[in-house]
């Protein structure tokens, strides 16, 4: 029980950070106008990952996308790449995860299978909220050297009384909704590496004895039934019609003189 | 058609109040960001007060910074300014405008005005 | 705050003249967001309150004649009128759209 709960928990904390990951790549706030200390303007600048926006007193707000790939700098190629590779792996993550559930009855799926693809989703989530955090951590290095430099020439004089304020740029929400989702994405993916080791099988260092009752071709296996969730089908518990002795494995046993009551 | 039109001007003492009213048509008043301007007797324009269309962040000059409050109604379509501790500087022709919204922040509509006179 | 400087302050004219004026800014009005210049200019004919002419430095308000012009980036502008006309005696206004607190020129008077 505490297994699959693992597991759905890890599942829907996951869900929630790549949502967050995909909602902070897509976001135009990364990089804000930094309003402290700076003069009072009527136009309030913000920056996304994909395009460049003015919001004005008026109420006008225009955007302009950076329609050039080769003009950008490598940084914030490498921002974009990060989260992109980072929303992928989640995405492919969840798709593995919804199969992985054991909650979700797929056909004879083995347990075993269901731990591997549980690990799989796991790892998955993982290396997505580190490209997610990288990423937005890479920005953020860049808006502090960026924003110190500014400070440095704050105002550039043009000769005279004339002054031009450069514009400094400070963290965006998309920064904190992006840290915050790769923060949820890593931990889903936690729980899920925890719930794999839950749901992989048990190695038993003997064989499982049928016991034949007399008139009835019933094996029986020691250690009862295990505690299961109802749903799946328990392969390794069920009853044995065929009159044969088998193993835990189905492997055709050899009576021994133990072997009948 | 875009109308903005003033009242509640007249002779006040120093040290009085007034209320000026901005009576607004022809647009959808409330997503709208609008201004105060006065233009002093010796013709000489002053931007005076800014409340900010949706937000309602308002702006102020320095020179009437606790004394003047601008507000609005969007209910009534109607722009405010609260005017205390009155003085002879402040007498001047107060328009109410409209800040365009494809206009750089530029005043696009002005009303006709409404005179203050603020003596004793 | 920003300074609006203009010059000159009065200009006499003759029917059918080119005209410039010049609208000078403490700060350039540039903003380097969209690489709009934010700066307004405006008519005011005696009794009645002022008319935008032109605002982003360069735009010409709808219904506003060819014959205005506005140019310049940062903190040096200008309008031109191609041709004056007996309706274009005025006085004209700049304005410092950018920072708060919005300030205005002194104005240019066009007369005959």
């Known amino acids: 029980m505490a297994v699959t709960a693992c597991q759905g928990l890890g599942f829907v904390v996951s869900l929630i950070g790549i949502a967050g990951i995909i909602a902070a790549t897509c976001m135009d706030q990364w990089s804000t106008q930094d309003l402290y200390n700076n003069p009072v303007t009527a136009v309030f600048n913000y920056q996304g990952l994909w395009r460049s926006c003015v919001r004005e007193s008026s109420g006008f707000t225009e955007c302009r996308g950076y329609f050039t790939l080769l003009g950008l700098p490598a940084m914030l190629q490498a921002v974009r790449a990060l989260m992109i590779v980072g929303i992928v792996l989640g995405a492919i993550g969840l798709l593995v995860s919804i199969f992985a559930l054991k909650c979700i009855r797929i056909g004879s799926m083995e347990d075993s299978a269901k731990a591997n693809m549980t690990l799989t989703s796991g790892i998955m989530f993982i290396v997505s909220g580190l490209c997610a955090i990288a990423g937005v951590s890479v920005f953020a290095n860049m808006l502090v050297t960026n924003f110190w430099m500014s400070t440095a020439n704050m105002y550039t004089g043009m000769g005279g009384m004339v002054q031009t304020v450069q514009t400094r740029y400070t963290f965006g929400a998309a920064l904190f909704v992006g840290w915050v989702a790769g923060g949820l994405t890593l931990i889903g993916g936690v729980m899920m590496c925890i719930a794999c080791r839950g749901l992989a099988p048990e190695e038993t260092n003997y064989k499982a004895v049928s016991y034949h009752a007399s008139g009835h071709s019933v094996a029986y296996k020691p250690g009862g039934f295990k505690a299961s969730t109802g749903f799946g089908s328990n392969t390794k518990n069920k009853k044995i019609y065929d009159g044969g002795a088998r193993t835990e494995d189905e492997v055709q046993s050899y009576p021994s003189k133990h072997d009948y009551v | 058609e875009v109308m903005l039109v003033e009242s509640g001007g007249g002779l006040v003492k120093p040290g009085g109040s007034l209320k000026l009213s901005c009576a607004a048509s022809g647009f959808t008043f409330s997503s709208y960001t609008m201004s105060w301007v006065r233009q002093t007797p010796e013709k000489r324009l002053e931007w005076v007060a800014t409340i900010i269309g949706g937000y309602g962040n308002t702006y102020y000059a320095d020179s009437v910074k606790g004394r003047f409050t601008i507000s609005r109604d969007s209910a009534k379509n109607t722009l405010y300014l609260q005017m205390i501790s009155l003085r002879s500087e402040d007498t001047a022709l107060y328009y109410c405008?409209?800040?365009?919204?494809?206009?750089?922040?530029?005043?696009?509509?002005w009303g006709q005005g409404t005179s203050v006179t603020v003596s004793s | 705050d920003i300074l609006m400087t203009q010059s000159p302050s009065s200009l006499s004219v003759s029917a059918g003249e080119k005209v410039t004026m010049s609208c000078k800014s403490s700060q350039s009005l540039l903003n380097s967001g969209n690489q709009k210049n934010y700066l307004a200019w405006y008519q005011q004919k005696p009794g009645q309150p002022p008319k935008l002419l032109i605002y982003?430095?360069?735009t010409r308000e709808s219904g506003v004649p060819d014959t205005f012009t506005g140019s310049g980036s940062g903190t040096d502008f200008t309008l031109t009128i191609s041709s004056v006309q007996a309706e274009d005696l005025a006085v004209y206004y700049c304005q410092n759209d950018y920072y708060y607190p919005f300030t205005f020129g002194a104005g240019t008077k066009l007369e005959l």
């Open positions: 982003g430095a360069s």
């Open positions: 405008t409209r800040l365009g919204q494809t206009q750089r922040n530029a005043m696009d509509y």
